[in-house]
Interface confidence: medium
């Protein structure tokens, strides 16, 4: 190989050992039969050399540094050449370094040709191995602006007082152009300006200077974003730290087109703006740090650019001004993430404060909009507390558990609407009366409606789930002893059409001791399947539940148990079942931990089924499934 550097070129070439490898044989640079492991070539020198091994790329790297002095004379602006040409260099991993020194008053602009640059952070690397490292200067201190790959959005970087640019090319890469040019600009009065151009949908992750170390004290850095007019941009902070400020405040400032309050100033911990149309600037401003305990300011953020959906141009009003103790959350539904670019899905308050989820609270009217490629990616969860504090007052009150119609007007699906019903302990109980009789969801007869009511205890220490109930069954009411949560859960978008079928009324009633009482009026056409609360986990210890089963005058009810035995094993106490005829009060008692369950039996009149649990041994829980069928009476037995 021969490398000749012109005298006025200001280029030095250094060939040196790269990262040591565990290769058995060493390799040397051979110059006039002399073996060495380092070769430095200065301007005006011409050197012939070879390598002592077949694969020098495994041993050596080459650095080509060009010093450009803009202090003493004119600056060579324009497209930057790779000198010496890569074809004249040995096939080693190459790093071209351009070190430009300029006055503080002169701005220097690096312009990158397409495919532009993409910044990457610690622990990442470029797929093709081509890397740009860009640094600036503040007085004598070097500041890392960032490390970049190809195929991104960064089109220009403006700095002042000097630039150090390093282009790393792997030995196998055929590239023979630098891919950037340098231009002079007027002073930018800040550390740097990075321009990021979006041609279409996409995202860019960018970082403050020196990231992940601290941003220089009291400095200002700006990012300029060029966004096609038909697209929308949203900013989200992925990672940030604040330093300890003695004077001034660390902040970000936005120049947003059409905003009447430019610049819009945000704290780093604020929700950042979204749904922005057109170009905008974002600036990071540091502060004067505490000398004793400076801390570090750093920021990594993402700009997401995407098409606005039809929905994002609409404002939706959610009127919770008359609601109390209510919160409505719009959030992403859980999905497996694909690896390709997924446009963001944001919900925006007052069109500007956009985030992946949003909670609206009661007592106000809220205006929201959406910035989302597909609104099925979001769902809504609502929680409402209805508490009674004065048992004398509540005892005559009923409340309608209905989903407010405003919620149906939103373009996202309702997932859960939960009412937490709270009563004074040992003073009142609750009764739920549905607008349409309910069916209990069982494996044998699953619900196939677009929604169900999930009824569970709301007492923290109690693990009691009464079950899932949907309209179209035989359960007329559910009485519960104490605090419960009732959750309307939707399973299909058709819930909007079926919404008229929803409707429960809760009333506060005198206190009773049983955990739950189900009032059932079987339908003559079908089996009514009923099962004990906490199915699969077992009825909680010492819990008692009852079913009040009505039998019409002209019908006979057949009560059938699913199993021959319950399988419960009592550690303490007894588990028993009482079946009582309501008319005669005649009752039969079955020991559930000893006796077999009764064979199918016929009831000509309304009857009670009461199940009371013991304290079961672990793994030997009490679960009971039974069903009731009606058949017409053939003989009048009244």
């Amino acid at each position: 190989f021969e490398i000749a550097l012109p005298r006025e070129s200001n280029i030095t070439v250094l060939i040196k050992l790269g990262t040591p490898t565990l290769l058995a044989k060493p390799c040397y640079i051979v110059i006039s039969k002399r073996h060495t492991t380092m070769l430095s070539i200065k301007p005006g020198e011409r050197i012939l050399f070879t390598f002592s091994c077949q694969s020098p790329e495994n041993h050596f790297v080459i650095e080509i540094q060009k010093n450009i002095d803009c202090m003493s004379g004119p600056c060579p602006f324009g497209e930057v050449q790779l000198q010496p040409s890569t074809s004249l260099l040995p096939t080693l991993n190459r790093t071209f370094i351009w070190d430009v020194k300029a006055h503080k008053s002169i701005g220097l602009e690096l312009q990158f040709s397409i495919p532009r640059l993409r910044q990457f952070g610690p622990g990442e690397s470029c797929p093709d191995g081509v890397t740009y490292s860009i640094s600036g200067r503040i007085d004598a201190t070097v500041v890392r602006i960032g490390t970049f790959c190809s195929n991104g959005t960064v089109s220009r970087i403006k700095m002042q007082e000097g630039v150090k640019m390093a282009l790393h090319l792997p030995w196998f890469h055929p590239r023979n152009v630098s891919g950037f040019s340098i231009a002079n600009r007027s002073s930018i009065k800040r550390l740097c300006i990075i321009e990021s151009v979006f041609e279409g949908e996409g995202s860019a992750t960018l970082m403050s200077a020196n990231y992940p170390e601290g941003f220089p004290e009291d400095e200002l850095m700006t990012w300029q974003f060029v966004i096609p007019a038909h697209l929308r941009a949203s900013v989200s902070f992925l990672n940030f730290n604040l330093s300890n400020c003695e004077r001034k405040e660390e902040r970000v400032e936005y120049y947003i087109p059409g905003s009447t309050t430019n610049p819009e100033v945000f704290k780093l911990e604020d929700k950042q703006p979204g749904n922005m149309a057109g170009n905008f600037n974002l600036s990071l401003q540091g502060c004067d740090q505490d000398a004793q305990n400076p801390g570090i300011l750093r920021l990594q953020f993402q700009v997401l650019v995407q098409h606005p959906q039809n929905e994002s141009n609409k404002i939706y009003v959610v009127d919770l001004s008359n609601e109390r103790a209510t919160s409505l959350t719009i959030e992403p539904r859980p999905v497996k993430q694909s690896r390709k670019f997924v446009p963001g899905c944001f919900v925006c308050l007052e069109s500007r404060t956009c985030s992946t989820n949003l909670t609206l609270t009661s007592g106000s009217k809220h205006k929201i909009s959406f910035l989302c490629d597909n609104l099925t990616r979001l769902w809504m969860n609502v929680e409402k507390n209805i508490s009674c504090t004065d048992h004398r007052y509540c005892q005559r009150k009923s409340y309608s558990l209905q989903v407010p119609s405003d919620i149906f007007h939103l373009p996202v699906e309702l997932h859960d609407f939960s009412w937490k019903l709270l009563v004074p302990k040992d003073r009142l109980s609750l009764v739920l009366v549905p607008a349409q009789k309910l069916q209990q969801h069982t494996h044998e007869k699953p619900c196939n409606t677009s929604f169900s009511y999930l009824v569970a205890s709301a007492i923290p220490s109690q693990d009691l789930y009464f079950g899932s109930f949907c309209p179209g069954g035989s359960i007329e009411q559910i009485q519960v002893k104490q605090n419960i949560s009732v959750t309307l859960r939707t399973f299909a978008p058709s819930f909007r059409q079926e919404a008229s079928r929803q409707g429960l009324t809760v009333s506060f009633i005198p206190y009773f001791k049983e955990e739950g009482v189900f009032t059932v009026t079987p339908d003559t056409k079908s089996k009514v399947y009923l099962r004990t609360p906490n199915w699969d986990r077992g009825l909680p210890s010492l819990t008692s539940v009852s079913w009040n089963i009505s039998v019409p005058r002209d019908q006979v009810a057949c009560l059938t148990f699913f199993k021959e035995r319950t399988g419960v094993v009592c550690q303490t106490g007894r588990a028993f079942m009482i079946i009582q005829e309501q008319r005669t009060r005649a009752e039969e008692i079955f020991s559930l931990d000893e006796d077999a369950l009764p064979k199918p039996r016929f009831h000509h009149h309304s009857f009670w089924v009461n199940i009371s649990n013991c304290s079961p041994a672990s793994g030997k829980q009490l679960d009971l499934l039974f069903w009731v069928t009606l058949t017409p009476r053939t003989v009048d037995l009244t």
């Epitope: 008359n322 103790a325 009217k365 009674c388 504090t389 409340y399 309608s400 209905q402 407010p404």
Partner: antibody, heavy 126, light 107 residues
Framework: QEQLVESGGGVVQPGRSLRLSCVTS????????MHWVRQAPGKGLEWVAV????????YYADTVKGRFTISRDNSKNTLYLQMNSLRAEDTGVYYC???????????????????WGQGTTITVSS | DILMTQSPSSLSASVGDRVTITCRAS??????LAWYQQKPGKVPKLLIY???TLQSGVPSRFSGSGSGTDFTLTISSLQPEDVATYFC?????????FGPGTKLEIK
């Protein structure tokens, strides 16, 4: 027995002022929002004003805004309506009414009005 | 402001008839609607709140339904004592406007 008794009505000339009172009993007055509603002779009901249980929020119908002031004295269990710059169209029966749910137990701020007074008549005429 | 309209403005029905009165809000009010009954010469009485919940002491022949903008008050079997004017009222937020009323008479 929950009771509301209005007083202070009478005949008054246009432009003059009048103050209505509503004395309550049989319930914890300080826990309830209170309303004034009026009814012109032979006409429907017109909501006039509401005051929250603690007096912090007050809202008025557009027809009386700036002229009428609703207030309450929880220590006296009494609701007031101060009416200034009276007009002929203010003539009617004025009812005080209790908000349908107390401030603590309710899942909503307003419920409708579940207890009404017998009303007091105002005639604005020259 | 939200406007409340009622229809019909008056109606005449026979004892035992099923009677329906409708109330419409010019904008959605969720289920924040109350129905009142005012008998001649008497004070108004709350019948139904939150669109469908019966006030305690009100006969079960009265029922309410609807949500959003359209609401109905139904008397399943008209009784002589039901002669009155019926008003709807929205209370999602102030002003708490009443409907103009529906006068119900017995044929």
């Amino acid at each position: 027995q929950e009771q509301l008794v209005e007083s202070g009505g009478g005949v008054v000339q246009p432009g003059r002022s009048l103050r209505l009172s509503c004395v309550t009993s049989g319930f914890t007055f300080s826990s309830y929002g209170m309303h004034w509603v009026r009814q012109a002779p032979g006409k429907g009901l017109e909501w006039v004003a509401v005051i929250w249980y603690d007096g912090t929020n007050k809202y008025y119908a557009d027809t009386v805004k700036g002229r009428f002031t609703i207030s309450r004295d929880n220590s006296k269990n009494t609701l007031y309506l101060q009416m200034n710059s009276l007009r002929a169209e203010d003539t009617g029966v004025y009812y005080c009414a209790r908000e349908g749910c107390d401030t603590i137990s309710c899942p909503y701020y307003y419920y409708g009005m579940d207890v009404w007074g017998q009303g007091t008549t105002i005639t604005v005429s020259s | 402001d939200i406007l409340m309209t009622q229809s019909p403005s008056s109606l005449s029905a026979s004892v035992g008839d099923r009677v329906t009165i409708t109330c419409r809000a010019s904008q959605g009010i969720n289920y924040y609607l109350a129905w009142y009954q005012q008998k001649p010469g008497k004070v108004p009485k709350l019948l139904i709140y939150t669109a469908s919940t019966l006030q305690s002491g009100v006969p079960s022949r009265f029922s309410g339904s609807g949500s959003g903008t359209d609401f109905t008050l139904t008397i399943s079997s008209l009784q002589p004592e039901d002669v009155a004017t019926y008003f709807c009222q929205k209370y999602n937020s102030a002003p708490f406007t009443f409907g103009p009323g529906t006068k119900l008479e017995i044929k």
